[in-house]
């Protein structure tokens, strides 16, 4: 016992955690002070009633990552005020109903992997009326839905359900709820899938599938009633499709009339690019999807992919579209003609290089688009990229950072509408008049800049933290500034006469620099109390570095002596 | 400056494995590829493979499947290449290359020389 | 396989001419309007350099008498006017499909 309760720490306010240690019972001594208990990750098998009888204000109970394998019925009887319970990862192999029927106030609980087959044989959780976030389900052992499982709850933020093994679904068991902000369903196979999502189109706002095989799936007609779809945002995660299932799933996506999302994370198309085009012509309508995610496409046969013209249609309605992180290196100029209302996209870690991405903007290219995104790819100089976008009219944000430019020339072409640009992470050690006039945001941190003496008349925001500037920059360069973040720089100092010269100027962020603590600095930081105001990062990331003594201390709490401040 | 730097020679018995490494510097390593090419002695150019930092995903020329494997240590910034069973067809040099745009070898390293013989 | 058949195997030429090596693949290296066909440069002893990517696009430090020509399977590369520095061995390489394929080489000579 005395063990036990040496692994466990409780605050001031009732927060108790002993998480990750050699538990193996709940710590004995537990009073209604307690608020919050985290306990994950230890040994504890066996949950008695007694245990918990006297945690009658407990709000949070984490359990997660025990071996607990019996529950006793009214282990939980006292816990009226508990909204979050967290039993996930044990060996509970029958849940009861008696459990929860006194968590009147639970708005979270998490009963995913343990290894029950069923979610009992009553309704667990039709006495939670204030449920919120419900998890449910295991990899392996949990083949069967019922039609009570979900009875009594009316409305859940999110349920997600591990199904990775579903060999059972009795019709209308999802039905029940009328309304699931996210449902998140694990399914290894298929088999089920056009059951689940009939009961569920009229109910749920965003319907996300992981970790499924679509290899083979067909689209069957569906019986989806008078009902209309509620299903706004499909996403696929960890999902297998080939060329000819994709268009099956097109199909079903069909079906959901107002479907305006779609996001495709970690899947993998084993495919070539051989969507045929009589397939497409019959059943392929886009709808009024209008965002489009793919984040870590992995195409195995990437080279061998062809024309894929047959979807170019689809795509004339969409108005944003990421492809991050998926090796592309080319958006053949067909495609980008047809995208007639794209005006975000977002093409962020992947290979694209001045030369093809010319092909990709080329004539009549993205017409609409106004914020490009080229994060973390492999261009390598900024005449030959602004001059590569000058065929985009309306382009007004580009954000090129994390690309390695090294040197930046005198002059330069950009879209002539140009108003947010980002150069972060880009190892530049200059800016120049290649720097567009038209800016209103610039993003210059961390790089390798000890200058900046641009005349940017419209700039309003400015971000050049993590370079190696010495001094404020020239106000009278900048004379609609509202935002300068500076911090991580090596400036020493900054004066009054400094600040008041940035008219506009209501936020400044200049921490995390190398400041000298004379006299003078400490008595204007110090003395204007309007100053925390501007200062964001006041008074936590204002440091001295010197004199020596006083180094590391915050610059509000640096009081130096007479002496030091009077010398003649 | 970019730059690709290998481990020396080898003399390895037939029979034997061997582990060449290409070290990166001057940029981002998880950024690009680095691929894997075969120059036999007076002989033209033969593709082994590819390897992306960022997921460790590996595309090879049928020809190298069984021969090659490919690694990357994104800590230190360097790539691997274990050739298995080698035999006096293997004695080359071999050079690691970056992959940049998807499609074209921008940067190489200066080539590891591999003998191969008893 | 594509297979990329480069011709002349070596070309013999006077300083300040024009050389031009021709490369023709076995099927087309077209990827949506742009053909994966690259050129490199190898003096003896040393790794070969990129001189062109994308059939026609000079890489970055490349002396500008060096330009690439061609589309679908036919390509060229053009050196004008040659130099002494030029006198070595030429490659062509296709990026279209797997496996990344290159030339026999070119290897060029003084006349």
């Known amino acids: 016992e005395s063990s036990n309760q040496a692994s466990l720490s409780c605050d001031r306010n009732g927060i108790c955690k002993g998480s990750s240690g050699s538990l193996n019972s709940i710590p004995s001594g537990l009073t209604e002070a307690v608020k919050s208990l985290d306990l994950s990750n230890n040994r504890i098998t066996y949950i008695s009633n007694s245990d918990l009888q006297r945690c009658v204000n407990l709000q949070a109970l984490v359990l997660t990552s025990n071996g607990i394998n019996t529950i006793e019925e009214d282990s939980f009887s006292s816990l009226g005020s508990l909204e979050h319970l967290d039993l996930s990862y044990n060996y509970l192999s029958n849940l009861s109903s008696s459990w929860f029927k006194p968590l009147s106030s639970l708005t979270f609980l998490n009963l995913l992997g343990n290894p029950y087959k069923t979610l009992g044989e009553t309704s667990l959780f039709s006495h939670l009326t204030k449920l919120q976030i419900l998890r449910v389900g295991n990899m392996d052992t949990f083949t069967k839905i019922q039609r009570k499982d979900f009875a009594g709850l009316t409305f859940l933020e999110e349920l997600e359900i591990d199904a990775s093994d579903l060999q059972s679904y009795e019709p209308k068991s999802l039905k029940s709820i009328q309304n699931v902000s996210h449902l998140i369903l694990h399914m290894k196979q298929h088999i089920l899938l056009l059951e689940i999502f009939v009961d569920v189109t009229s109910s749920v706002e965003c319907l996300e599938l992981r970790d499924t095989d679509l290899d083979t799936f067909h689209f069957s007609e569906l019986s989806t009633g008078e009902t209309n779809s509620l299903i706004k945002k499909f996403t696929f995660r960890n999902v297998k499709i080939t060329d000819e299932s994709l268009f099956q799933v097109m199909k079903l996506l069909n079906q959901i009339s107002g479907l305006l999302e779609l996001e495709f994370d970690d899947c993998t198309l084993n495919g070539v690019g051989n969507f045929r085009a009589s397939d497409n012509d019959r059943v392929i309508d886009p709808g009024k999807v209008e965002t489009l995610t793919i984040r870590r496409l992995h195409i195995p046969r990437f080279y061998l992919f062809y024309d894929l013209s047959t979807l170019y249609s689809l795509t004339e309605r969409v108005k944003r579209i990421t492809v991050e992180n998926s090796k592309v290196f080319l958006v053949p100029c067909l495609l980008s003609q047809h995208l007639k209302s794209l005006e975000y996209l977002d093409l962020s870690e992947n290979l694209m290089v001045e030369e093809y991405l010319k092909n990709s903007a080329c004539e009549d290219a993205w017409p609409s688009l106004q914020t490009l995104i080229l994060r973390q790819n492999h261009l390598a100089s900024l005449e030959k990229t602004g001059e590569t976008l000058l065929t985009l009219k309306n382009l007004t944000n580009i954000d090129i950072s994390k690309n390695s430019f090294h040197s930046m020339p005198e002059t330069c072409q950009w879209p002539e509408k140009m108003k947010y640009l980002n150069l972060s992470s880009t190892r530049i050690h200059s800016v120049t008049g290649c720097i567009p006039k038209t800016l209103e945001i610039l993003d210059v941190s961390n790089n390798n800049l000890n200058l900046f003496s641009l005349n940017l008349p419209q700039l309003k925001e400015l971000y050049i933290s993590r370079n190696k500037l010495m001094t404020l920059p020239d106000a009278s360069l900048l004379p609609m500034l509202l935002v300068l973040k500076i911090s991580r720089n090596a400036i020493t100092t900054f004066s009054k006469e400094q600040l008041d010269s940035f008219h506009t100027l209501k936020t400044l962020e200049a921490g995390g620099n190398n400041f000298i603590c004379s006299c003078e600095f400490l008595s204007f930081t110090q003395e204007q109390q309007a100053l925390a105001k501007v200062l964001i990062d006041w008074p936590a990331n204002y440091l001295c570095d010197s004199p020596s003594h006083v180094r590391g201390q915050q610059v509000q709490d640096v009081r130096l002596s007479v002496s030091e401040c009077h010398r003649t | 400056q970019v730059q690709l730097q290998q481990s020396g020679p080898e003399l390895v018995n037939p029979g034997a494995s061997v582990k060449l490494s290409c070290k990166a510097s001057g940029f981002t390593f998880t950024t690009y590829g680095i691929n894997w090419v075969k120059q036999g002695p007076g002989q033209g150019l033969e593709w082994i493979g590819w390897i992306y930092p960022r997921d460790g995903s590996t595309n090879f020329n049928e020809n190298f499947k069984d021969k090659a494997a490919l690694t990357v240590d994104t800590s230190s910034s360097t790539a691997y290449m274990e050739l298995h069973s080698l035999t006096s067809e293997d004695s080359a040099v071999y050079f690691c290359?970056?992959?940049?745009?998807?499609?074209?070898?921008?940067?190489w390293g200066q080539g590891t020389t591999l003998t191969v013989s008893s | 396989d594509i297979v990329l058949t480069q011709s002349p195997a070596s070309l013999a030429v006077s300083l300040g001419q024009r050389a031009t090596i021709s490369c023709r693949a076995s099927e087309s290296v077209e990827y949506y309007g742009t053909s994966l066909m690259q050129w490199y440069q190898q003096k003896p002893g040393q790794p070969p350099k990129l001189l062109i990517f994308?059939?026609?696009n000079v890489e970055s430090g490349v002396p500008v008498r060096f330009s690439g020509s061609g589309s679908g399977t036919d390509f060229s590369l053009n050196i004008h006017p040659v130099e002494e520095d030029d006198i070595v061995m030429y490659f062509c390489?296709?990026?279209?499909?797997?496996?990344?394929?290159f030339g026999g080489g070119t290897k060029l000579e003084i006349k």
């Open positions: 994308g059939a026609s």
């Open positions: 390489q296709q990026s279209r499909k797997l496996p990344w394929t």
């Open positions: 290359a970056r992959l940049t745009g998807g499609t074209f070898l921008d940067w």
